[in-house]
Interface confidence: medium
């Protein structure tokens, strides 16, 4: 996480800054949503617990050709200690439950806001 580069300035950024920037990007996505996000693509729902950043990335990385979430995918990769590729499946996914990307983003945003408020930046 300490290696996560800021998008406004190069070099390492503190975990609180990285989380804040991720939240701001998710807010930006929900604000600018004119048509169905990613054409209504469905992704695996995840348990919002420890390890959720990797799980979130594993879900979203399977959505291709959706420029609206590319920045989010890059940001999430900075929070995940291992390399994630399409087709990976984590135990944190809620099996047999798929939701629209728009709902996934809203749920993730809600949870990240809670973490930020509580000072849980890692």
């Amino acid at each position: 996480l300490t290696c996560l580069g800021g998008f406004a300035s190069p070099g390492p950024v503190p975990p609180s800054t990285a989380l804040r920037e991720l939240i701001e990007e998710l807010v930006n996505i929900t604000q600018n949503q004119k048509a169905p996000l990613c054409n209504g693509s469905m992704v695996w729902s995840i348990n919002l617990t420890a390890g959720m950043y990797c799980a979130a990335l594993e879900s979203l990385i399977n959505v291709s050709g959706c420029s609206a979430i590319e920045k989010t995918q890059r940001m999430l990769s900075g929070f995940c200690p291992h390399k994630v590729s399409a087709g990976q499946f984590s135990s944190l996914h809620v099996r047999d439950t798929k939701i629209e990307v728009a709902q996934f983003v809203k749920d993730l945003l809600l949870h990240l806001k809670k973490l930020f408020r509580e000072g849980q930046f890692n």
Epitope: T17, R20, E24, K113, F116, R117
Partner: antibody, heavy 121, light 107 residues
Framework: EVQLVESGGGLVKPGGSLRLSCAAS????????MNWVRQAPGKGLEWVSY????????YYGDSVKGRFTISRDNAKNSLYLQMNSLRAEDTAVYYC??????????????WGQGTMVTVSS | DIQMTQSPSSLSASVGDRVTITCRAS??????LGWYQQKPGKAPKRLIY???SLQSGVPSRFSGSGSGTEFTLTISSLQPEDFATYYC?????????FGPGTKVDIK
């Protein structure tokens, strides 16, 4: 002491321009998103604009979109509002207000004292 | 845009009274709501954030509750310095919107 101090208000003719400034002190300005809020005489509060901590995200209220521009200089701990094509209905006290993270957390915890903008011929 | 309505628009009360102000959002905003107090000629002051969390330094007679679309600010025992106008603010989505305000004056 955490403080926000606005300046730049004054009397301007309709169609004119004005640039407001907000000087921040007592906290790490670059870690906070910032907003402008205004209040017309005898009226309620109206949110005007938002800028994220790292300049990446900017939003405006419909009534000022295309006329006002929000900006910031983190090196100078300053927030700005460039107001063009001013109208009589823009007459108000303008406040800058601190924000944790846009549209999410504990918005508007610290406010400046306000600067008065009067648009009149 | 999310519309915020506040009731009542004004109220007269006496020192020691329990005062309740309600704010409604036109759509769900979770707990992204703050309550502000404003006195004439002064900047607003935050009392409550995240719908129910008390701002540091604010007396405990102020409390907030609610989630989703309906929120309440309660002053358990009104004090002379509490006579002011109170606003709610939703900061769930842009444009941020304030309620029209509730003026609390002396009966």
């Amino acid at each position: 002491e955490v403080q926000l101090v606005e300046s730049g208000g004054g009397l301007v003719k309709p169609g004119g321009s004005l640039r407001l400034s907000c000087a921040a002190s007592g906290f790490t300005f670059s870690s906070y998103s910032m907003n402008w809020v205004r209040q017309a005489p005898g009226k309620g509060l109206e949110w005007v604009s938002y800028i994220s901590s790292s300049y990446n995200y900017i939003y405006y209220g419909d009534s000022v979109k295309g006329r006002f521009t929000i900006s910031r200089d983190n090196a100078k701990n300053s927030l700005y509002l460039q107001m063009n094509s001013l109208r009589a209905e823009d007459t108000a006290v303008y406040y800058c207000a601190r924000d944790q993270v846009g549209a999410t957390l504990d918005a508007f915890d610290i406010w400046g004292q306000g600067t008065m903008v009067t648009v009149s011929s | 845009d999310i519309q915020m309505t506040q009731s009542p628009s004004s109220l007269s009360a006496s020192v020691g009274d329990r005062v309740t102000i309600t704010c409604r959002a036109s759509q769900g905003i979770g707990d992204d709501l703050g309550w502000y107090q404003q006195k004439p000629g002064k900047a607003p002051k935050r009392l409550i954030y995240a719908a129910s969390s008390l701002q540091s330094g604010v007396p405990s007679r102020f409390s907030g509750s609610g989630s989703g679309t309906e929120f309440t600010l309660t002053i358990s025992s009104l004090q002379p310095e509490d006579f002011a106008t109170y606003y709610c603010l939703q900061h769930n989505s842009y444009p941020f919107t304030f309620g029209p305000g509730t003026k609390v004056d002396i009966k």
